[in-house]
Interface confidence: low
């Protein structure tokens, strides 16, 4: 019989490569290679016959997740050697191009290219708050689907999101990426009580999140490097800016902060009054 049987399944292409060291028996006519699902499992039995000078062959369309017995026989005329055999379970292909889109404070959109395999019956999406190890959300989509929106998430949290390829009776290794939901910004920026060196800034806090604080940054429009920063209690939604320059336009931004995460800033401009003569 041949020796050193080696089996290699490519999960991306579904191709099984069978290789061996050629028999030392003289004048052989070739090799017969069979792949058969073990233990009476449902699946195709395949066979190839190759020339004596070949030491490998390939099989397409093996069912991932199914165990196959692979045997190689030396053939001489109408006689066969005892086979050299091994088993292999072709892996279920996993996604390679998972990406995130349309991230908000409560949702994360997923995109991927559906895998081209008739054995795939769908994908399982699992969401875990980073570091918890416990799935907080799980859903299933059909094999033709290449998008999903995970909703009902909390703002400013890192989530580990996994997509697993499903076949009948098996699944792939997970493709996992981590993404943080956004911290919602404040809204409705207003300026009141404008004086030559002061102004009152108010805003509406975002709903449904217990913030750590607000960050208020302000600087003259013509000198934005000269920025001052104030940290405001999350229970406050106003601040009075003092020691401003008269008759000067200021750019003011207010950001929400949740733990170490900052929202996109809410920006506005306001000019201070002129000094009375």
């Amino acid at each position: 019989p041949p020796t050193n049987l080696h089996l290699e399944a490519n999960p991306d292409t579904g191709v099984l490569t069978v290789s061996w060291e050629r028999s030392t028996t003289p004048d052989i006519t070739g090799y017969r290679i069979t792949t058969t699902p073990t233990n009476g499992q449902q699946g195709n039995s395949l066979e190839e016959v190759v020339h004596a000078d070949q030491s490998s062959c390939t099989f397409d369309n093996l069912s991932p997740g199914l165990e196959y017995n692979v045997s190689v026989y030396t053939v001489k005329d109408d006689k066969e050697s005892v086979p050299i055999s091994d088993t292999i379970i072709p892996e279920v292909p996993q996604l390679t191009d998972l990406s995130f889109v349309d991230i908000t404070d409560s949702s994360i959109g997923l995109r991927w290219t559906p895998l081209n395999s008739s054995t795939i019956i769908g994908y399982r999406i699992t969401v875990v708050a980073a570091g918890e190890g416990i799935p907080i959300f799980e859903d299933f989509v059909d094999s033709s689907v290449g998008y999903y929106t995970v909703t009902g998430l909390e703002p400013g949290i890192d989530y580990d999101i996994s997509v697993i390829t499903l076949i009948n009776g098996g699944e792939s290794a997970p493709t996992t990426l981590t993404q943080q939901t956004a911290v919602p910004p404040p809204t409705d920026l207003r300026f009141t009580n404008i004086g030559p060196d002061t102004m009152r800034v108010t805003w509406a806090p975002p709903p449904s999140i217990d913030l750590t604080n607000f960050l208020v940054r302000y600087s003259p429009v013509k000198n934005e490097e000269d920025v001052a920063e104030l940290s405001i209690s999350p229970s406050d939604n106003a601040v009075v800016l003092t020691n401003l320059l008269p008759g000067t336009e200021y750019v003011v931004s207010v950001s929400s902060v949740y733990e170490q995460h900052e929202s996109t800033p809410l920006r506005g401009r306001q000019k201070t009054g002129l000094d009375s003569p």
């Epitope: 019956i121 190890g133 799935p135 907080i136 959300f137 859903d139 299933f140 998008y147 929106t149």
Partner: antibody, heavy 115, light 113 residues
């Protein structure tokens, strides 16, 4: 305001059909996995069916498989449950529920009586 | 018979602490899935009370708390009040490939004496 409102319940004879509707407002129905859950008189909650968010995959409890069909019309932001071959044991209040981290929003329920 | 097991009823005087247990198996709670709790006041729809084992949605009083260990979970109500008289249900996803299954406990009636 985020809200679910069911309708379509009523009295029906065994073997008959009903279609329940669940109108969603304040959020986009297609972004969420949506469920039907029922509660027989004096009994506990029983999961009936699910339609997945994003994908349109559907799942059913064994007790209703082959008789009930869950669907949704994204343009109307409405979830449906088509119930055929109804039996006395299907008598219950039927709730639609949105699945976020849990069933975070429930409708008020619609009563189905099979008699 | 429900997949998750809860006591049919518990009771307590106002101000007391009561706990409701929810026992599952390695196919649901023990598989690492979250447990959620729902409150159903008489004649109304269920309402989410605790999600992800121990988290309270906004608007739920902090006298309600949840915990989970192994294949079981529990809901505690401290400082019991008359308006807490209701049915309480635990829930968890269920391992069942491509089934989307969700299982509930049989419910526990809380009576305020």
């Amino acid at each position: 305001e985020v809200q679910l409102v069911e309708s379509g319940g009523g009295l029906v004879q065994p073997g008959g059909s009903l279609r329940l509707s669940c109108a969603a407002s304040g959020f986009t129905l297609s972004s969420y996995a949506m469920h039907w859950v029922r509660q027989a008189p004096g009994k506990g909650l029983e999961w009936v069916s699910t339609i997945s968010g994003g994908g349109g995959s559907t799942y059913y409890a064994d007790s209703v498989k082959g008789r009930f069909t869950i669907s949704r019309d994204n343009s109307k932001n409405t979830l449906y449950l088509q119930m055929n071959s109804l039996r006395a044991e299907d008598t219950a209040v039927y709730y639609c529920a949105r699945r976020g981290r849990a069933f975070d929003i429930w409708g008020q329920g619609t009563t189905v009586t099979v008699s | 018979q429900s997949v998750l097991t809860q006591p049919p009823s518990v009771s307590g005087a106002p101000g007391q602490r009561v706990t409701i247990s929810c026992t599952g198996s390695s196919s649901n709670i023990g598989a690492g899935y979250d447990v959620h709790w729902y409150q159903q006041l008489p004649g109304t729809a269920p309402k989410l009370l605790i999600y992800g084992n121990s988290n309270r949605p906004s608007g739920v009083p902090d006298r309600f708390s949840g915990s989970k260990s192994g294949t079981s979970a529990s809901l505690a109500i401290t400082g019991l009040q008359a308006e807490d008289e209701a049915d309480y249900y635990c829930s968890s996803p269920m391992i069942s490939s491509l089934s989307g299954h969700v299982v509930f406990g049989g419910g526990t009636k809380v009576t305020v004496l």
